[in-house]
């Protein structure tokens, strides 16, 4: 199925040019999306091209500049947040990145009613997190690992926590491992719906081993970065959840929410918090051995000013074939009765589907079913449930938005997006206004992305928010590669693949093949999305065929495929890449003497193992920031899939699945190993150990490090990286420069 057919006739071909590496590095063909910043059922904010903050009212069609670019510029603001009472805006400047989601910044509060910055009781700097209450203009913020509360922006702050300490106690913000592997946010505090209560997590990292690495900087001596980072089997953070009444914060102070007994009996994690009403909260907990999750609904006891979590309101989710959930355990979406909820989990056939839980999980009513998966619940209203799935036409790499009418019986299902722009748009996400009065659809491809606004009642398209016209025009004279998404059936396993083919692809010719792999548990690489990136250039200009394959362990095709890698990382992911390569060779247009594989992070691990598989299939390959041993990676992630590195658990496979154990097998391949020295995520240690093992085995290899760069290898390093990898591949494939 050719998803991006060439738009060219032969007569026009001489006016067309191939993509260049410069195009990719300059971001010449990047696209824009439009996500409205909803502030009501019919209004949203958007930062205009000239940096004014504009409020749009869909119903009246009017727009209002609520904050001028002049005001934004006066404090060098790069972000903003309107208070729910619309009296104030916080302006964020001096952005300083920390980890994946976290950053610190300076915050200024601007009073919209008098057009002046709030003076007196200004916020300290730098702040780790700041947010408005959902109603009014209370402020909660985290400074130096402690939480503070302001009733109004100009008021003095009330300090909620006092024990915060760098790298020891984190209040209202996650530590490294919770940020990266559990919460996927920079915050760990949650306002109740009307701002009466504030819940927060406290993470105690006192006993966690510390990863230390040098940051070279420009000084005479490098400084050492220390991060409490629990690797597999190590001591984990200790988490506690507290709730404070923000109206009278000093009255009883923070109240701890009890942990369910079946969770508290051994090491555990807190996984998410969902407010239901101002006086009901839902917490999710997970055993350290991550196949048991407990959802606990707790109620405020006015008489005792405490939170009560009755056992009758505990819902257990357990996996017998793998870990609980997909990548994370799904979160509940509560219905209007404030006790029943909708949640995605595996059905009896092993497909993730929406279930409605009224009393017990055992009595859950299955809302969706089929040999496909429900992926996200966007919104539940009185009469509709909006969700995304990959059901349509049985392509796992697509995402369409569906509406189920829950107000009527039997519920009826409608695909909102399936036939909107069928060729252009097969991968959607959505963003809903209050009460789903309106919603924005963001289509990511396979054609040029487009964002549109829709009526939440009729699903009628109201207007195009962003259609990337300039990109469309810029691509008119570019010879883009062709892309196809197909599947291989091998030994009862379906291997979906995406193949990126040179513009003048001819099946009778032979082409070098590059496999791009990620392959991590619950990931998906074969998606119907638009991209003009490095591999597009390699196909367009350098005439390579590039393939991406979703093997065992990948997501959204059922538990059989997903959980196949449970406790056995590094085996089937690699096997399936190799199997796919053999099938590609059989197709007749691959030059089997010129096959390479590359990947980043988990993909670096898989590419390394594939190169060291001893098959003789690969001439060369690249590993960027690879994991080399699961003993070196974070506990939360690693143990989810591998269990513990102990003798009585899974130590043997931890040892067997290292890259170092296969050092000898790199002798007959060209290997390029790349890593940033300041990688907080997959530590440089991983590549250092690979290099040491290769040296000890007297195996030649190439390597590149990026000083002071993290897992993303951003900025100028990106240009250097892709230039370097291009040279390596062209040399490997004997392509002239």
């Amino acid at each position: 199925i050719v998803l991006r057919p060439s738009r060219v006739h032969n007569s026009e071909e001489n006016t067309m040019r191939a993509l260049t590496l410069k195009d990719i590095l300059n971001g010449t063909f990047s696209y824009k999306t439009f996500f409205p910043n909803w502030i009501s059922g019919q209004e949203y904010l958007h930062q205009s091209a000239d940096n004014n903050i504009v409020l749009y009212n869909i119903e009246t069609g009017q727009s209002y500049t609520i904050l001028s670019n002049r005001t934004m510029k006066s404090v060098n603001a790069s972000n903003y947040g309107l208070s729910p009472d619309r009296q104030f805006v916080y302006l964020e400047s001096d952005y300083s990145k920390l980890w994946r989601y976290s950053y610190t910044a300076t915050y200024y509060i601007y009073d919209l009613s008098n057009g002046e910055f709030v003076r007196g009781n200004e916020l300290p700097r730098p702040i780790q997190y700041l947010c408005w209450s959902p109603v009014g203009s209370k402020l909660a913020y985290v400074y130096q690992n402690n939480i503070y509360l302001k009733q109004r922006p100009g008021d003095p702050p009330f300090q909620i926590t006092f024990n915060g300490r760098e790298n020891k106690i984190f209040n209202g913000i996650p530590d490294w491992v919770y940020e990266e592997e559990m919460l996927a946010t920079k915050y760990a505090l949650w306002w109740s719906p009307n701002g009466k209560f504030l819940a927060y997590a406290e993470f105690n990292d006192t006993d966690i081993p510390v990863i230390a690495y040098s940051y070279y900087g420009d000084e005479q001596y490098p400084r050492t970065i220390n991060i409490p980072y629990p690797k597999a089997g190590a001591k984990n953070p200790v988490v506690r959840i507290f709730i404070i009444d923000t109206t009278y914060p000093a009255y009883v102070g923070p109240q701890e929410v009890p942990v369910p007994a079946m969770i508290a009996s051994s090491d555990y994690y807190f996984s998410w918090l969902t407010w239901v009403t101002d006086e009901r909260v839902c917490l999710q907990w997970l055993k350290r051995v991550q196949n048991v999750s407990v959802l606990s609904i707790c109620d405020f006891r006015e008489d005792w000013q405490t939170w009560d979590c009755p056992k009758t309101q505990e819902h257990i989710e357990e996996s017998r074939t793998g870990w609980a959930g997909g990548f994370f355990v799904s979160t509940p979406v509560f219905s209007y009765d404030a006790i029943s909820y909708y949640k995605i989990f595996s059905d009896k056939d092993g497909y993730k589907h929406i279930h409605y839980i009224k009393d017990t999980v055992e009595n859950a009513i299955q809302i969706t079913s089929g040999k496909w998966e429900a992926i996200n619940i966007f919104r539940v209203t009185q009469d509709s449930l909006f969700y995304s799935s990959n059901e349509f036409e049985e392509y796992p790499g697509r995402r369409n938005i569906y509406r189920i009418s829950i107000g009527s019986y039997p519920p009826s299902k409608k695909c909102v997006t399936c036939h909107l722009r069928k060729e252009r748009c097969q991968y959607y996400t959505a963003s809903f206004s209050d009460y789903a009065k309106y919603y924005a659809l963001v289509c990511y491809g396979p054609g040029i992305p487009i964002s549109t606004l829709h009526d939440g009642r009729t699903d009628q398209e109201i207007k195009i928010l962003e259609e990337n016209k300039e990109l469309e025009n810029a691509l008119k004279n570019i010879q883009l590669p062709k892309e196809e998404i197909k599947k291989l059936e091998v030994d009862e396993i379906t291997l979906w693949y995406k193949m990126i083919l040179p513009p003048q692809f001819d099946r009778s010719k032979k082409y070098p093949l590059l496999i791009q792999v990620y392959g991590g548990p619950c990931s998906q690489s074969v998606r119907s999305v638009f991209a003009v990136n490095w591999i597009s250039y390699l196909a367009s200009k350098e005439g390579m065929v590039i393939a991406l394959v979703d093997g065992r362990g990948t997501a959204f095709q059922g538990d059989k495929l997903l959980y196949a890698v449970y406790r056995k990382l590094g085996v089937y992911e690699v096997e399936d890449q190799i199997t796919a390569v053999r099938k590609f060779i059989e197709m007749g247009f691959i030059d089997e003497k010129r096959i390479a594989i590359w990947g980043w992070s988990y993909g670096g691990y898989v590419s390394s193992l594939a190169l060291a598989s001893g098959t003789g299939l690969f001439k060369c390959g690249i590993a960027v920031a690879p994991v080399s041993s699961w003993e070196y990676y974070a506990s939360v992630y690693t143990e989810r899939f591998m269990g513990l590195p102990t003798k009585d658990d899974n130590l043997e496979h931890y040892k067997n699945s290292t890259v170092m154990a296969r050092a000898e097998y790199f002798r007959n391949v060209d290997y390029l190993l790349i890593h940033g020295t300041a990688d907080d995520n997959v530590h440089f240690q991983n590549s250092a150990q690979i290099a040491k093992a290769l040296v000890n085995a007297q195996v030649d290899f190439q390597a590149m490090w990026y000083s002071d760069q993290n897992h993303g290898l951003s900025g100028l390093s990106t240009n250097h990286l892709y230039t370097h990898m291009t040279h390596f591949l062209k040399q490997c494939f004997s392509l002239s420069d």
């Epitope: 009017q62 727009s63 209002y64 609520i66 009613s113």
Partner: antibody, heavy 119, light 107 residues
Framework: QVQLVQSGAEVKKPGSSVKVSCKAS????????INWVRQAPGQGLEWMGL???????NYNQKFQGRVTITKDNSTSTAYMELSSLRSEDTAVYYC?????????????WGQGTLVTVSS | DIQMTQSPSSLSASVGDRVTITCKAS??????VAWYQQKPGKAPKLLIY???YRYTGVPSRFSGSGSGTDFTLTISSLQPEDFATYYC?????????FGQGTKVEIK
């Protein structure tokens, strides 16, 4: 600071028209709606209509065909014209600022213009 | 049109009293209700918008609540300068409509 200054009192004959002006300062008419509200002697408040930031209008059905609201952004002045005047149109007419920051409630009021319709 | 019915139409109270004025909408107006204060010979002044948000500079003794069809304006401790007429208004849809007013007089 924000101000809405209205034109002076008017005495009009039944059947004639009146045009009340409202000069805005401290804000731009391209960024706020201007509403017109009237109050008959000893009576309550009655919303007549508005002119949006973009220049579009919305009128109370009760006045449809008789009221016209316009504005001149360059002079920051809004106007309300009421035709076919009757004695019951005797009232104080207010121009009032509205906008999204107060959920389209009416936050700044002019001082009012008394229009007397009398033969 | 949406009708706004205010009650009482007048009330007598003393300084320091807690005063409550209610307003009922003929249909659901969500939280789009504002309250105004008007003194004789003067233009009305905005007190509360979106049912519960106090407008800038309005004393904290004034508070608003409600959603849907039932709304309340409360003056927690009546001050001499609070004797005036109070109006509710829905700003949910056009035409914007006002309640008939509540006159707060000195007892």
């Amino acid at each position: 600071q924000v101000q809405l200054v209205q034109s002076g009192a008017e005495v009009k004959k039944p059947g004639s028209s009146v045009k009340v002006s409202c000069k805005a300062s401290g804000f731009s008419l391209t960024n706020y709606d201007i509403n017109w509200v009237r109050q008959a002697p000893g009576q309550g408040l009655e919303w007549m209509g508005l002119i949006w930031t973009g220049g579009g209008t919305n009128y109370n059905q009760k006045f449809q065909g008789r009221v016209t609201i316009t504005k001149d952004n360059s002079t920051s002045t809004a106007y309300m014209e009421l035709s076919s005047l009757r004695s019951e149109d005797t009232a104080v007419y207010y121009c009032v600022r509205g906008g999204p920051l107060v959920w389209y409630a009416l936050d700044y009021w002019g001082q009012g213009t008394l229009v007397t319709v009398s033969s | 049109d949406i009708q706004m019915t205010q009650s009482p139409s007048s009330l007598s109270a003393s300084v320091g009293d807690r005063v409550t004025i209610t307003c009922k909408a003929s249909q659901d107006v969500s939280t789009a209700v504002a309250w105004y204060q008007q003194k004789p010979g003067k233009a009305p002044k905005l007190l509360i918008y979106s049912a519960s948000y106090r407008y800038t500079g309005v004393p904290s003794r004034f508070s608003g609540s409600g959603s849907g069809t039932d709304f309340t304006l409360t003056i927690s401790s009546l001050q001499p300068e609070d004797f005036a007429t109070y109006y509710c208004q829905q700003h949910y849809s056009n035409p914007r409509t006002f309640g008939q007013g509540t006159k707060v007089e000195i007892k």
